[in-house]
Interface confidence: low
């Protein structure tokens, strides 16, 4: 028995073409980079920019490159032993909750609160209440002062696979 | 709404053939998706033949069905077909071709069914 | 290949009942990558299997929440908190990761 098709973003089309490049697998696995081919005997390269595959493994395909969607920005190519890392666009971010989509930032605080943590890839802005120094979280209500931020600057990327 | 229309019942004498068929609908047919075809013997459970990969013609299958069976696809119809050779009474069967989807491993959409009967 | 083995094969119940179906496989069906392709289908008389369950415990996008799914390994398990007329039919668990994916022999569920 040879395993199957895994979780998340495996692409058939981009099965072994008879030129990639083969080798043998290692106690029945392949090593990052390749993937196994169906009767288990020969390991086959990813296609560099198409699929990958990051640990030793037994896959019947490489793993499809992520696209970075638009409001994303491509901070690191895929090749054939890393996915694409693709991050949320200035003034934009994603939260761990909803991981599908970047979401504006909010441009100010809500009244009576005080901005104390800017716009990040990863979390928008932060605010405390002036008087307590409490973190607000949860809807922001409709009245919202002026206070505008800028957008922070992207310290570290938000790795997307899939 | 992601439809499989199967072909009719067939009813064929034992060494004969028979290809039946399944037009896909409702989605991109080339998309991540693989075509896998099912026999369910009379009152008895499932058994996987093989898929067909539709967007270059890949194809796996079930070691028992090797040699018996053939799979292909037509892209320009969306349709995938299914050939059965040397037909014997084992053989008689209903035959669900399904839809796998390629990122998680299970059959989220399954055909009507097609009654192949083999009978002198 | 990998034996999938239900039990019961038959399962007769009340309606508003509890019911609960075991699949027992050979062998781990863990896969390499950490995830175990265990998946649920009903097929009612007359019809098509359909996906109830993926991944062990994973409801397919419309199915009740009667409906659950458990276990590990090689022992895993469908509920049905209570059991509806509609939920009659042949249940059949199904491993997928590896080839060939198996089913088991179906378990039938009737009043």
């Known amino acids: 028995e040879s395993a199957l098709i895994t979780q998340q973003d495996l692409a058939p089309q981009q099965r072994a073409a008879p030129q990639q490049k083969r080798s043998s697998p290692s106690e029945g696995l392949c090593p990052p980079g390749h993937h196994i081919s169906e009767d288990g005997r020969d390991c086959i390269s990813c296609k560099y920019g198409q699929d990958y595959s990051t640990h030793w493994n037994d896959l019947l395909f490489c793993l499809r490159c992520t696209r970075c969607d638009s409001g994303e920005v491509e901070l690191s190519p895929c090749t054939t032993t890393r996915n694409t890392v693709c991050q949320c666009e200035e003034g934009t971010f994603r939260e761990e909750d909803s991981p599908e989509m970047c979401r504006k930032c909010r441009t100010g605080c809500p009244r009576g609160m005080v901005k104390v943590g800017d716009c990040t890839p990863w979390s928008d802005i932060e605010c405390v209440h002036k008087e307590s120094g409490t973190k607000h979280s949860g809807e922001v209500p409709a009245v919202e002062e002026t206070v505008t931020s800028s957008p922070g600057t992207p310290a570290s990327p938000c790795s997307l696979s899939g | 709404e992601v439809q499989l229309q199967q072909s009719g019942p067939e009813l064929v004498k034992p060494g004969a053939s028979v290809k039946i068929s399944c037009k896909a609908s409702?989605?991109?047919?080339?998309?991540?998706?693989?075509l896998n075809w099912v026999k369910q013997s009379h009152g008895k459970s499932l058994e996987w033949i093989g898929y067909i990969y539709p967007n270059n013609g890949d194809t796996s299958y079930n070691q028992k069905f090797k040699g018996k069976t053939t799979l292909t696809v037509d892209k320009s119809s969306s349709t995938a077909y299914m050939e059965f050779r040397s037909l014997t009474s084992e053989d008689s069967a209903v035959y669900y071709c399904?839809?796998?989807?390629?990122?998680?491993?299970?059959?989220?959409?399954w055909g009507t069914g097609t009654t192949v009967t083999v009978s002198s | 290949d990998v034996l999938m083995t239900q039990t019961p094969l038959s399962l007769p119940v009340s309606l508003g009942d509890q019911a609960s179906i075991s699949c027992r496989s050979s062998?781990?069906?863990?896969?390499?990558?950490?995830?175990?392709?265990l998946d649920w289908y009903l097929q009612k008389p007359g019809q098509s299997p359909k996906l109830l369950i993926y991944k062990v415990s994973n409801r397919f996008s419309g199915v009740p929440d009667r409906f659950s799914g458990s276990g590990s390994g090689t022992d895993f398990t469908l509920k049905i908190s209570r059991v509806v007329a509609e939920d009659l039919g042949v249940y059949y668990c199904?491993?997928?990761?590896?080839?060939?994916?198996?089913f088991g022999a179906g378990t039938k569920l009737e009043k």
């Open positions: 399904t839809r796998g989807s390629n990122w998680i491993w299970y059959f989220d959409v």
């Open positions: 062998q781990s069906i863990v896969h390499s990558n950490g995830d175990t392709y």
């Open positions: 409702g989605y991109t047919f080339t998309d991540y998706y693989y």
């Open positions: 199904f491993r997928g990761s590896h080839i060939p994916p198996t």
